[in-house]
């Protein structure tokens, strides 16, 4: 009789994560009597995967019924494969021994490669908001994929970006890999509704890439422009001054009126109007009783937007020494100045 050989017909097997791997092994003889064991890896550090004689291996089933006579098929199935299962698997025949069975012959090994999908890309922007014309960085991360080959692209509103750097780790062999990419984006005033998209393509995704998005509304700060105007007189000795706060984002805004440097009123933007580009407009007005002032009045509209240093715009009301009958239109003149 010819000496037993252990045949592992597949040099390699490729399995998708979550699926079941079949590792084939046959013996060419019933002799010697003794169990089959499966190991991952070789040498003293090898990992026992299945032992016909004893042990509990919940993820492993045998393809054939090993108790049936003449059985020489020792193939196994490993369920719920993960990237951590990748490696070379050896089917090893043991010879019955006393007290312990003795390793008799090993198969040539089957390399199990695991195809694992990348995780959904997570895009994160800068910690603090930035204003238009500034360049900000966005990062995109995806993990747990195998094999290593992967393609990552960046888009802003559907237009592909070119200013980015990507790394796949680790550089050497691993059971699974991670990708990290950083893209630079120049902000414009129109970016409140813009999106940055990170797109990851991998062999496991069958041409249907994964996408992660970041809304620039989380990143951008569009500072307001201020305009202070004097409205027609509503009543004698009264002047209505308005402060137009335009094109700001986000909405968080506090406005303070000062009369000759003294706080007259503070209010928070509430009933704002939204522009098509996603920015907001707001208007505040101040009714000034001219007769209460002997001298010229300097009115200042001071705006603190999104926790930033205040910006202000002033308006000078010149209180006339002439009698009232000159008309309220001439009771005050206005000059404007911008102050920060």
């Amino acid at each position: 009789e010819e000496e037993l050989q252990v045949i592992q017909p597949d040099k390699s097997v490729l399995v998708a994560a979550g699926e079941t791997a079949t590792l084939r092994c046959t013996a060419t003889s019933l002799i010697p009597v003794g169990p089959i064991q499966w190991f991952r890896g070789a040498g003293p550090g090898r990992e026992l995967i299945y032992n016909q004689k004893e042990g509990h291996f919940p993820r492993v089933t045998t393809v054939s019924d090993l108790t049936k006579r003449n059985n020489m098929d020792f193939s196994i199935r490993i369920s719920n494969i993960t990237p951590a299962d990748a490696g070379t698997y050896y089917c090893v025949k043991f010879r019955k021994g006393s007290p312990d069975d003795v390793e008799f012959k090993s198969g040539a090994g089957t390399e199990l490669s695991v195809r694992a999908k990348p995780s959904a890309p997570v895009v994160s922007g800068p910690a603090a908001r930035a204003t238009p014309q500034h360049t900000v960085s966005f990062t995109c991360e995806s993990h747990g994929f195998s094999p290593r080959d992967i393609t990552l692209k960046w888009f802003k509103n559907g237009n592909e970006l070119s200013d980015f750097q990507t790394n796949v780790d680790p550089v050497g062999e691993s059971v699974s890999y991670s990708i990290h990419s950083t893209a630079k984006v120049v902000l414009t005033r129109e970016d409140v509704h813009s999106q940055v998209i990170c797109e990851v393509a991998h062999v496991t995704l069958q041409g249907d890439p994964l996408r992660g998005t970041a809304n620039l509304s989380e990143t951008i700060r569009v500072p307001p422009t201020l305009e202070v105007t004097q409205q027609p007189v509503r009543a004698e000795n009264q002047v209505n001054v308005t402060c137009q706060v335009r094109k700001f984002y986000p909405q968080r805004l506090q406005l303070t009126w000062l009369e000759n440097g003294n706080v007259s009123r503070t209010e928070t933007a509430s009933t704002v109007t939204e522009n098509k580009d996603g920015t907001y407009n707001w208007m505040s007005w101040l009714l000034v009783n001219v007769s209460a002032h002997r001298d010229d009045v300097k009115l200042t509209c001071q705006v603190e937007h999104d926790g930033q240093p205040a910006v202000s715009k002033s308006h000078d009301l010149k209180v006339s020494a002439h009698p009232k009958e000159q008309g309220s239109n001439t009771a005050a003149e206005n000059t404007g100045s911008n102050e920060r």
Partner: antibody, heavy 119, light 110 residues
Framework: QVQLVQSGAEVKKPGASVKVSCKAS????????INWVRQAPGQGLEWIAM????????HYNQIFKDRATLTTDTSTSTAYMELRSLRSDDTAVYYC????????????WGRGTLVTVSS | DIVLTQSPDSLAVSLGERATINCRAS??????????IFWYQQKPGQPPKLLIY???NRDSGVPDRFSGSGSGTDFTLTISSLQAEDVAVYYC????????FGQGTKLEIK
């Protein structure tokens, strides 16, 4: 180390039944056949039956087919052989034996259980 | 059913001498390229012990003075140099179909 530990000796009256147990250890119980063999005093070996604990498949010697029943309890790795309608010529040592190569052979044996049938 | 007949029923051999026990099957026990014959040794008060499987393969721990041979219907267990501890009853068994045993051969020292 494979071990098969059998239940103790039994004395039974003719017509009664006996159930002998065989507790296995040192291996995965469901992966190997268990055989039952008996030996009357001063006589040779007589094969009774075999059972596959994984699916309870059984094969019986025709002589014992109507009187013997093999069962297993996989939770305790124990095999049982019940013999009914006992006669005096059923007096024997009853052995369980494990088939390590699925060759329908007997690689590891229990120490035997003496069953005496006497009125 | 296949019947196994051993010969002789008993045998006395001097220490150091060769002992030969025969087992004849009523029909061939060869199947799938194997001869489905096994040999056991049973000492008084002990369970049998497997010596030879598939006609010619020594079980683990069995001294190499024990050997099995034969094919088809005729098989032989040979002890090349009898030792005192070899005194026992020897049984052949087939598993070409469901197992049966030979009637046994008692080996003694002359």
């Amino acid at each position: 180390q494979v071990q098969l530990v059998q239940s103790g000796a039994e004395v039974k009256k003719p017509g009664a039944s006996v159930k002998v147990s065989c507790k296995a250890s040192g291996y995965t119980f469901t992966n190997y056949w268990i055989n039952w063999v008996r030996q009357a005093p001063g006589q040779g070996l007589e094969w009774i039956a075999m059972i596959d604990p994984s699916d309870s498949e059984t094969h019986y010697n025709q002589i014992f087919k109507d009187r013997a029943t093999l069962t297993t309890d996989t939770s305790t790795s124990t095999a049982y052989m019940e013999l009914r309608s006992l006669r005096s010529d059923d007096t024997a040592v009853y052995y369980c034996a494990m088939d390590y190569g699925s060759l329908y052979a007997m690689d590891y044996w229990g120490r035997g259980t003496l069953v005496t049938v006497s009125s | 059913d296949i019947v196994l007949t051993q010969s002789p029923d008993s045998l006395a051999v001097s220490l150091g001498e060769r002992a030969t026990i025969n087992c004849r099957a009523s029909q061939s026990v060869r199947s799938s390229g194997y001869n489905w014959i096994f040999w056991y040794q049973q000492k008084p008060g002990q369970p049998p012990k497997l010596l030879i499987y598939l006609a010619s393969n020594r079980d683990s721990g069995v001294p190499d003075r024990f050997s099995g041979s034969g094919s088809g219907t005729d098989f032989t267990l040979t002890i090349s140099s009898l030792q005192a501890e070899d005194v026992a009853v020897y049984y052949c068994q087939h598993s070409r179909e469901l197992p049966t045993f030979g009637q046994g051969t008692k080996l003694e020292i002359k």
